[in-house]
Every structure is written in C-alpha cells, then in structure tokens.
Amino acid sequence: FERTRSLQDPCSNCPAGTFCDNNRNQICSPCPPNSFSSAGGQRTCDICRQCKGVFRTRKECSSTSNAECDCTPGFHCLGAGCSMCEQDCKQGQELTKKGCKDCCFGTFNDQKRGICRPWTNCSLDGKSVLVNGTKERDVVCGPSPADLSPGASSVTPPAPAREPGHSPQ
C-alpha cells in the first residue's frame, strides 16, 4: 500500500527548484525568490542563507541550492559550512578577550589563527637547540650535544655501555 501511494503521490513528480503547492491542488510551483529546494517532492522551499555583516557570499542562492558564505578579509571560517567567522591575528599572536595579543615568551604561532603553542623542548629528545624560537617560529632542534663534540664523526658508532654519571673519555 505504501509503495502504491507513493507512486500515486503527485508531489513526487515535483523536481528540485519547485514545491508541491497544497493551495493549488498539489501543482508543482517554482520556489519563491530567496528560497530553494535541493531535492524533488518537497512540500516547501527552504529560505536561502543570507551572508551578512562579516560574512560574504561565496556562491549565490539558486532555486535548487542554498547560498554559501565565507568570511570577509581579516576573518576566517569556523564550524561546519562556515557558520562562524573569527578575526585573524598576525603570526606571533593569538586572539584573546582583549583582541590579538603577542605570544608569551616561550610560545609561538606560525598562523593567523589558533593559539600560541610552547616551543619544542629539544632536550626531551636528547637534542640541542640549533635555531632559537621566536613568537612566529618554533625552535629548530639539532644533533645531541654529544654528537657535536670535537672529533665526532658524522656517523656515530654505538656507544659502549657505561655507568651513569661517567662522561665519555
């Protein structure tokens, strides 16, 4: 019965861009201005998204597809389908409750968005700092201090086992 009814339902013949108008004996009527239907058989058209304020139109609304927004220059999208716009900051800054603020010493941000992150701790990997970090850039870790000792070859053989606290001779 359900299949028979759907086959007889005149609304199922209404294509995308139209709606099944109950007020007009279920005739397929075009979506009114500023509305759309992306699938067939719909009984109403959806209101088009409006890109206003900090949002700007990336793709105009049509009778069969919704408008798409992105953010005005100086802002970037957040959320599914760009549901929010967040202000950019400069590299070396993060967005706080006082606006864009420089990263604290020991942290960096190499993007216009997101938060300041701590510099890499090279010593945790047994390495030394090759290039110091800045507000905009992480530190660059180099070889371990032992690898940089005079006379050390570029290919270091496995070190013999030794008691802790004894330096290599």
């Epitope: 998204r49 949002f55 929010m84 716009c85 202000q87």
Partner: nanobody, 122 residues
C-alpha cells in the same frame, strides 16, 4: 524584522569625542550580547568592543581607556562613547548582535547595522 541603526558619526578633530548610538528593534535586546566593529579605509574589519547582557565589557587594546561601550535596555540602544580620538580611529563603525560570546567571533545568525562613518582629522 530585526533592525540595527547606527548614528552619531561625523567629523571630529584629533583629541575630540563622539558618542555613537545603535537603535535596536525586532529582537529581545535586553538579553542579547552586543558588539561594535570597525573598518578603516582600505583595511580589514576589526572587532572593537563587546558587552554582555549582564553589562560585562571587553575592548580591543588600542581603544582601552578611550572608548566606553554601554547599553540602555529601556531604550533598546547600544552606545560607544569615544574620547581622545586619533586619526587611526577613522573608520565605518558597525554595531552587531554577538551570539558566540567569543571575542572577535560572529555567528551567521548575527545581525549587523549599515554602519556610521567616523572621521578624525584636523
């Protein structure tokens, strides 16, 4: 229909003062957080100040101590009192609803006014 109508802009000398107003209608102003943003000629839009429905306020560092955001819920009006104005404050100032409650972040459902031009020049 939601409407935000800014007024009070104009030409002012450096060091002078102006008070911008934003008359709101079509929504429950008293329970809505609000904000001001501005766009200087040839520059990007930037957040200036925000106020919660409770009255708690936030300011971008460059205007702190010079600008004061306030609201009159009885009159459905948002204000921005600007003093010690500088040439770099020249911009179109916009008022907007502020649903995210996150500084510098606006939601697609927020409403914006058309803006009022403030020119600081001698």
């Amino acid at each position: 229909e939601v409407q935000l109508l800014e007024s009070g802009g104009g030409l002012v000398q450096p060091g002078g003062s102006l008070r911008l107003s934003c008359a709101a209608s079509g929504f429950t102003f008293s329970s809505s957080a609000m904000s001001w943003a501005r766009q200087a000629p040839g520059k990007e839009l930037e957040w200036v100040s925000s106020i919660y429905s409770s009255g708690k306020t936030y300011y971008v560092e460059s205007v702190k101590g010079r600008f004061t955001i306030s609201r009159d819920n009885a009159k459905n009006t948002l204000y921005l009192q600007m003093s010690s104005l500088r040439a770099e404050d020249t911009a179109v100032y916009y008022c907007a609803t502020w649903k995210t409650l996150r500084v510098g972040v606006w939601d697609e459902s927020d409403y914006w006014g058309q803006g009022t031009l403030v020119t600081v020049s001698s």
